[in-house]
């Protein structure tokens, strides 16, 4: 890989676990300024594999609120507005990083945690297993 | 909201920006042990709104590699295997948190950053505007 020289202005770390424990500035920089504000706003309702959004709250996690998608149907909505069970609605999942307070209830100490969230649903052709 | 008492075993912070700057342990705890490892593995190909995955790499970011979905078609795949433009493939986007090295090239100092990523695609009914 590319070796990038260390910036001489980096803060020192006297933590014995360095570089596993790092300093993180929580003033979030938002890179999304140029994105289309409409984004996925109403896709959950207009999709052929519609979903509901459920609030998942955990004060020991940062961010404390995460929205989880749950597909409304097992099948997909066809042109007549009916659920077609020849197709399947499935959740699209993504692993994301969150910060978990560690030790618990500490305001200034966290551990990185990987969690799996469902972001929305998509309609897929089912894998059909025929009986011999 | 619920007030949780501070744990007396929390580390002290002498940083003047506290609580904006916190300590984070990068030994990731993975909560996904019970998830189906196949997960969304082949949905990108079986979906009626299929997508390709593009690798986005940035050594100044943690995680340095993020996969971005790009919908393959404007329309959706119908039962005949044709792309149907009466329906629209659209990306499902999600805001995620990443760590950005700050100052640049520093191994132990980061800032939280919010970025928008496309996770997959879904098929939606278009909003049709006819000319009067």
């Amino acid at each position: 890989g590319i070796t990038i020289p260390r910036n001489p202005g980096c803060p020192n770390s006297e933590d014995k676990n360095f570089p596993r424990t790092v300093m993180v500035n929580l003033n979030i920089h938002n890179r999304n300024t140029n994105t289309n504000p409409k984004r996925s706003s109403d896709y959950y309702n207009r999709s052929t594999s519609p979903w509901n959004l459920h609030r998942n709250e955990d004060p020991e996690r940062y961010p404390s609120v995460i929205w989880e998608a749950k597909c409304r149907h097992l099948g997909c909505i066809n042109a007549d507005g009916n659920v077609d069970y020849h197709m399947n609605s499935v959740p699209i999942q993504q692993e994301i990083l969150v910060l978990r307070r560690e030790p618990p209830h500490c305001p200034n100490s966290f551990r990185l945690e990987k969690i799996l969230v469902s972001v929305g649903c998509t309609c897929v052709t089912p894998i059909v297993h025929h009986v011999a | 909201g619920i007030t949780i008492p501070r744990n007396p075993g929390c580390p002290n912070s002498e940083d003047k920006n506290f609580p904006r700057t916190v300590m984070v342990n990068l030994n990731i705890h993975n909560r996904n042990t019970n998830t189906n490892p196949k997960r969304s593995s082949d949905y990108y190909n079986r979906s009626t709104s299929p997508w390709n995955l593009h690798r986005n790499e940035d050594p100044e970011r943690y995680p340095s590699v993020i996969w971005e979905a790009k919908c393959r078609h404007l329309g959706c795949i119908n039962a005949d295997g044709n792309v149907d433009y009466h329906m629209n493939s659209v990306p499902i986007q999600q805001e995620i948190l990443v760590l950005r090295r700050e100052p640049p090239h520093c191994p132990n100092s980061f800032r939280l950053e919010k970025i928008l990523v496309s996770v997959g695609c879904t098929c939606v009914t278009p909003i049709v505007h006819h000319v009067a």
Epitope: - | V83, P91, V128
Partner: antibody, heavy 119, light 111 residues
């Protein structure tokens, strides 16, 4: 560099079928889609069909029952078959590359092959 | 299918003048993903069409900056700031938000 070259019979009798081949170079059919477009003498362009890199297709609905598109990725060839030709199918037939993102535009075109339907 | 209407049919201009081509669609070309798939092509006499502008306003590689595209929804314009002799030919607009269709073309000729 990117090139597309159409080859066809030139003359087709009414009610017969037409088969045209588009041979491409400078890019792979596993990465790019290919469109067929035609242009009757002195007239505008009419889009016919596209075959995408993943093998899916989209047809002009008015002509769908008469058209068939296939490809051979290893030979870098795309094939168009059109049935039941009539005199108004006389046109220059072009193949064109889709610009890589599946839905933007046709960035490179062949020089076309002239097809005359006549007895 | 979406009908693309181009005006005028013929556009006589003097070399060095500005030329403006209009294209109107029978329904909005804004896709659910927020993009607008409206493109412009030039077909010179005896040649196949060449891509000039894609997605309303993006110049294709090698296209001079005297060509510019604008518009939204259903109304679009292609402008040539200073017409040169090599610009003569028929200009077609095309949409690919829906099943692709082309306009009838506008012929650019010298006054």
């Amino acid at each position: 560099q990117v090139q597309l070259k159409e080859s066809g019979p030139g003359l087709v009798a009414p009610s017969q079928s037409l088969s045209i081949t588009c041979t491409v170079s400078g890019f792979s059919l596993t990465t790019y889609g290919v469109h067929w477009i035609r242009q009757p003498p002195g007239k505008g362009l009419e889009w016919l069909v596209v075959i995408w890199s993943d093998g899916y297709t989209t047809y002009n609905s008015a002509l769908k029952s008469r058209l068939s598109i296939t490809k051979d990725n290893s030979k870098s060839q795309v094939f168009l078959k059109m049935n039941s030709l009539q005199t108004d199918d006389t046109a220059m037939y072009y193949c064109a590359r889709n610009d890589g993102d599946y839905f933007y535009s046709m960035d490179y075109w062949g020089q076309g092959t002239s097809v005359t339907v006549s007895s | 299918d979406v009908v693309m209407t181009q005006t005028p049919l013929s556009l006589p201009v003097s070399l060095g003048d500005q030329a403006s081509f209009s294209c109107r669609s029978s329904q909005s070309l804004v896709h659910s993903n927020g993009n607008t798939y409206l493109h412009w092509y030039l077909q010179k006499p005896g040649q196949s069409p060449k891509l000039l502008i894609y997605k309303v306003s993006n110049r294709f590689s090698g296209v001079p900056d005297r060509f510019s595209g604008s518009g939204s929804g259903t109304d679009f314009t292609l402008k040539i700031s200073r017409v040169e002799a090599e610009d003569l030919g028929v200009y077609f607009c095309s949409q690919s938000t829906h099943v692709p269709t082309f306009g009838g073309g506008t012929k650019l000729e010298i006054k």
